[in-house]
Interface confidence: medium
């Protein structure tokens, strides 16, 4: 059929609760382009009739709520002008209820139900909740070990809960609940989140400021040798490590035989108040398989890609 | 609205003491690094302290001519900027702005910048 | 200290003129330099930060450019309220250091 595939995610979600997923995918999802949602390769659309329990809404899929037989692979197809791109995502659902035991023993959570609060500091947990726009959700209540949190060291704010000088104790199971209205009719959706402490001095929470690449294309002939640059802004006493991976696979090591894609040694400059780093990766020769691959920019938990593709062929010379 | 009110200016005899203060309001400001920045009568701008937000630490910076006889500090909970000055020269004599730093360090560095002003007291040392 | 050298002084123009104000730093401060205006018992204002960045509410007549060393606050058509003067500022590195400020008075 012509469409790109394009291996996404991995999800591990709460049964008998909403989740929704955005198919974004910014390289493509920018301009003009159609979205359709499928589940484990139908041929038939996930529906977009508002009252069923899972439909489109928009360039979303929204599961209302989500059951324990919802778990596969759904794929989003982004169909632009000239490309067609499938990107599968792969939903886990498990029976979970939050005060029975530990998420400790989930696998591949994501950093959104994995937090860290920095010992002696102010800082603060995030309720990471992603629905479109047709859902309005309430205010957000926070518990932790299944009791209500309640005290003057912890503020709700929003999406987050502020918690001021963070103590040992703070470590544990948290979850934050909302109830979400769709449609008239009120879901209840509860996050779970392991907390664990640091002691790591510094600025607290900091996370690095990938300014280049943007998650974007850049367009290359087949055969040529390229450099791109990643340039990184960190605070100064920052501990975190930058690298260039593939494949969740670090270029060196994917590519350790043939060393046709290598990333560069890091340098950095040194400003007021941060540390601007650059490391930079070096295709020496492209070939057709580095087309539509993201190549991914680490710096911590942030993370930005670069993916090839082949120039718009230019008639004028004929 | 983004508001700075400094207060405490007025006449002092060199070699005393003047304490300012700058209520803030409008914005989160136990997120900002702050500032104190001076203006002589019919002069440049000349910068005077900085002190960081509590994520960095309370650091603080001061310029070569009040080291060590100027003192900035915070309350956080009051929303309150303060400058302790202390020896007073009659040099010191100048309209005393406190400005807000755009550089907040809330997860990674903002433009570096004085993007807000007081409307500035002023502080006169002479005998 | 960083030491920022801001030219000319003063100058002279009309409305509708096309303006260029010139900051110059000892060393290489990169591109954390900001303009600011300022009007006779007022407080300053930031016009332009990170050498090319519009503060809110900045007309876009205004511009600024440069890097490293050499900067430059252009106006592209002198308005009647834009006669004030302007500081740079460095904030590349403590102490923070201002020019000496150029005076834009009207011709």
């Known amino acids: 059929d012509g469409c790109k595939d394009i291996f996404m995610k991995n999800e591990i979600l709460s049964a008998s609760q909403p989740f929704a997923f955005n198919c974004t995918f910014p390289p493509i999802t920018s301009g003009e382009v159609s979205v359709t949602w499928y589940k484990n390769s139908s041929k038939i659309p996930v529906s977009k009739i508002i009252q069923s329990r899972i439909h489109q809404d928009e360039t979303w899929i929204l599961f209302l709520p989500m059951e324990w037989g919802d778990s596969g692979v759904y794929q989003c197809v982004i169909k632009g002008r000239d490309s067609c791109h499938r990107i599968h995502v792969n939903l886990t659902v498990f029976e979970k209820h939050w005060c029975d035991t530990s998420i400790g023993g989930l696998p591949n959570l994501s950093d959104e139900y994995k937090q860290i609060l920095h010992l002696g500091k102010d800082d603060s947990l995030t309720c990471h909740l992603h629905f479109p726009k047709s859902c309005v959700l309430g205010p957000i209540k926070w518990y932790k070990d299944c009791n209500e949190i309640k005290g003057e060291r912890f503020t709700v704010l929003e999406t987050r809960l502020l918690v001021s000088n963070v103590s040992a104790e703070d470590r544990g199971n948290y979850a934050c609940q909302a109830i979400l209205t769709h449609s008239g009719k009120q879901y209840e959706v509860l996050n779970g989140i392991t907390v664990s402490i640091t002691e790591r001095a510094g600025y607290g929470g900091s996370v690095p400021k990938i300014i280049y690449p943007k998650n974007h294309s850049i367009e290359v002939q087949l055969g040529t040798t390229l450099i791109v640059d990643c340039n990184v802004t960190d605070t100064k006493d920052n501990t975190n490590l930058r690298c260039w991976r593939v494949n969740n696979t670090l270029v060196d090591d994917y590519y350790d035989e043939s060393k046709r894609i290598r990333e560069g040694v890091e340098t950095h400059v040194s400003f007021r108040e941060h540390n601007l780093y650059t490391v930079n990766i070096t295709f020496l020769e492209v070939k057709m398989e580095d087309y539509g691959l993201p190549f991914m920019c680490h710096a911590g938990v942030s993370t930005a890609y670069i993916i090839l593709q082949l120039p718009a062929p230019d008639f004028r010379a004929y | 609205e983004v508001q700075l009110v400094e207060s405490g200016g007025g006449l002092v005899k060199p070699g005393g003491s003047l304490r300012l203060s700058c209520a803030a309001s409008g914005f989160a400001f136990t997120d900002y690094y702050m500032n104190w920045v001076r203006q002589a009568p019919g002069k440049g701008l000349e910068w005077v302290a900085l002190i960081r937000n509590k994520a960095a630490g309370y650091t603080i910076y001061y310029s070569a001519p009040v080291k060590g006889r100027f003192t900035i500090s915070r309350d956080d909970s009051k929303s309150t900027l303060y400058l302790q000055m202390n020896s007073l020269k009659t040099e010191d004599t100048a309209v005393y702005y406190c400005?807000?730093?755009?550089?907040?360090?809330?997860?990674?560095?903002?433009?570096?910048?004085?993007?807000?002003w007081g409307q500035g007291t002023l502080v006169t040392v002479s005998s | 200290d960083i030491v920022m050298t801001q030219s000319p002084s003063s100058v002279s123009a009309s409305v509708g003129d096309r303006v260029t104000i010139t900051c110059r730093a000892s060393q290489n401060i990169n591109i954390w330099l900001s303009w600011y205006q300022q009007k006779p018992g007022k407080a300053p204002k930031l016009f332009i930060y990170k050498a090319s960045n519009l503060h809110t509410g900045v007309p876009s007549r205004f511009s600024g450019s440069g890097s490293g060393t050499d900067f430059t606050l252009t106006i592209s058509s002198l308005q009647p309220e834009d006669f004030a003067t302007y500081y740079c500022l460095q904030s590349q590195s403590y102490p923070l250091t201002f020019g000496q400020g150029t005076k834009l008075e009207i011709k």
């Open positions: 400005v807000r730093d755009m550089t907040i360090y809330d997860g990674y560095y903002v433009d570096y910048a004085l993007d807000y």
